[in-house]
């Protein structure tokens, strides 16, 4: 039994880091393998993660972490029974994938303005809470070409757009994702999308 693709890990910078790897053949990850991880710190103890299958030879493990700070470094040991298959380390702050925003809502009752709001996925005491920026994706269910991205570079989790920038009388969907420049993170997954019917009063034209 050998590791074909070494574990790579990403952290949500809150409580979970996810490590994925591939073995050299079909493996029952949960019965055959264990991933041991330990914070490099005087008071820390080793923890064991039981991996799950992720395709035939792929494994994934969700490492539970009490808290994350920028200097944290973890040792990782991948075991098959008594055999050490791989040894490595992981610094969560260097491999951050933020949590996806939630509770995306489209408010359509504000004088021909669409107000999109969503929730910051982090609690106020987490470092990322004040460092997230967002991308909002809006698209038409009827027209695949009607697809747009709005970058929200301010901290407030909201976006206002004129309803007239979208076509009237058709349905749209929106979703939002987050990233943090401070840790050069990857983008989060997209939030679940929300749907609304776009309608607004055309301005009265005088001839």
């Amino acid at each position: 039994m050998k590791v074909l693709q070494e574990p790579t890990c990403v952290s949500d910078y809150m409580s979970i880091s996810t490590c994925e790897w591939k073995m050299n053949g079909p493996t029952n990850c949960s019965t055959e393998l264990r991933l041991l991880y330990q914070l490099v710190f005087l008071l820390s103890e080793a923890h064991t993660c039981i991996p799950e299958n992720n395709g035939g030879a792929g494994c994934v493990c969700h490492l539970l972490m009490d808290d994350v700070v920028s200097a944290d470094n973890y040792t990782l040991d991948l075991w098959a029974g008594q055999q050490l298959l791989w040894k490595g380390s992981f610094k969560p702050s260097e491999h951050v994938k933020p949590r996806a925003p939630g509770n995306l809502t489209v408010h359509t009752n504000v004088s021909d303005t669409l107000l999109l709001t969503w929730s910051n996925p982090y609690p106020p005491d987490n470092y990322l809470y004040n460092h997230l920026t967002y991308a909002v994706n809006i698209w038409s269910e009827n027209d695949p070409a009607d697809f747009r991205i709005y970058n929200v570079t301010y901290l407030e989790p909201s976006l206002r757009i004129a309803a007239s920038t979208l076509k009237s009388g058709i349905s749209y969907r929106a979703r939002v994702r987050a990233w943090a420049q401070c840790y050069n993170t990857t983008w989060s997954e997209w939030s679940p999308s929300t749907k609304w019917h776009n309608s607004y009063r055309e301005p009265f034209e005088q001839h």
Partner: antibody, heavy 120, light 106 residues
């Protein structure tokens, strides 16, 4: 609300042993944290003396290792400092403090301190 | 053991001024903490793991650094900040403290 309270003799003669007690309320000393003794000398210099962890393992400042012992009584939620062969150099304010993994050992909780004078 | 040297020993500042105090270690440190102590009181946790503010610490305080050099900055000093600030490492035994920086108001 976690609170720590030191208690001890206040005055000890040179060459005798010092015994201090830290009583913890609002948190079980077996749940988490390293439970430390720290002292502050008259010139305000702080010195870490040692800890006993929630699991019962202990670690000491090598400069005190031959003289120090930190133990606990889990039934009373107390931990103790014993320092042997004291000299006038051990005159200080003695603090107990709790520091845990979550804040990477930050001493989150401190007692108000007890002043110890070593004098004949 | 890791020796922590704090500078300056005494820092005199006017209200509203920005001040920075430093803590240098003789060996690399992973986690540096800071405490505030006022006369007659025990030290209070102030900043943990280099840059994280402890509960109740005003946002005008910040911490930074890595390796052997760390600093605590107050963006706008207020009268209530008058105190002695100690750095402390928990990277190797024995745990050690700096000698402190005493912040005074002009």
């Amino acid at each position: 609300d976690v609170q720590l309270q030191e208690s001890g003799p206040g005055l000890v003669k040179p060459s005798q042993s010092l015994s201090l007690t830290c009583t913890v309320t609002g948190y079980s000393i077996t749940s988490d944290y390293a439970w430390n003794w720290i002292r502050q000398f008259p010139g305000n210099k702080l010195e870490w003396m040692g800890y006993i962890s929630y699991s019962g393992s202990s670690s000491y400042n090598p400069s005190l290792k031959s003289r120090i012992s930190i133990t606990r009584d889990t039934s009373k939620n107390q931990f103790f400092l014993q320092l042997n062969s004291v000299t006038t150099d051990d005159t200080a304010t003695y603090y107990c403090a709790g520091g845990g993994l979550r804040r990477r050992g930050l001493f989150d909780y401190w007692g108000q301190g007890t002043t110890l004078t070593v004098s004949s | 053991q890791i020796v922590l040297s704090q500078s300056p020993a005494i820092l005199s500042a006017s209200p509203g001024e920005k001040v920075t105090m430093t803590c240098r270690a003789t060996s690399s440190v992973t986690y540096m903490h800071w405490y505030q102590q006022k006369p007659g009181s025990s030290p209070k946790p102030w900043i943990y793991a280099t840059s994280n503010l402890a509960s109740g610490v005003p946002a005008r305080f910040s911490g930074s650094g890595s390796g052997t050099s760390y600093s605590l900055t107050i963006s706008r000093v207020e009268a209530e900040d008058t105190a002695t600030y100690y750095c402390q490492q928990w990277s190797s035994i024995p745990l050690t403290f700096g000698a402190g920086t005493k912040l005074e108001l002009k």
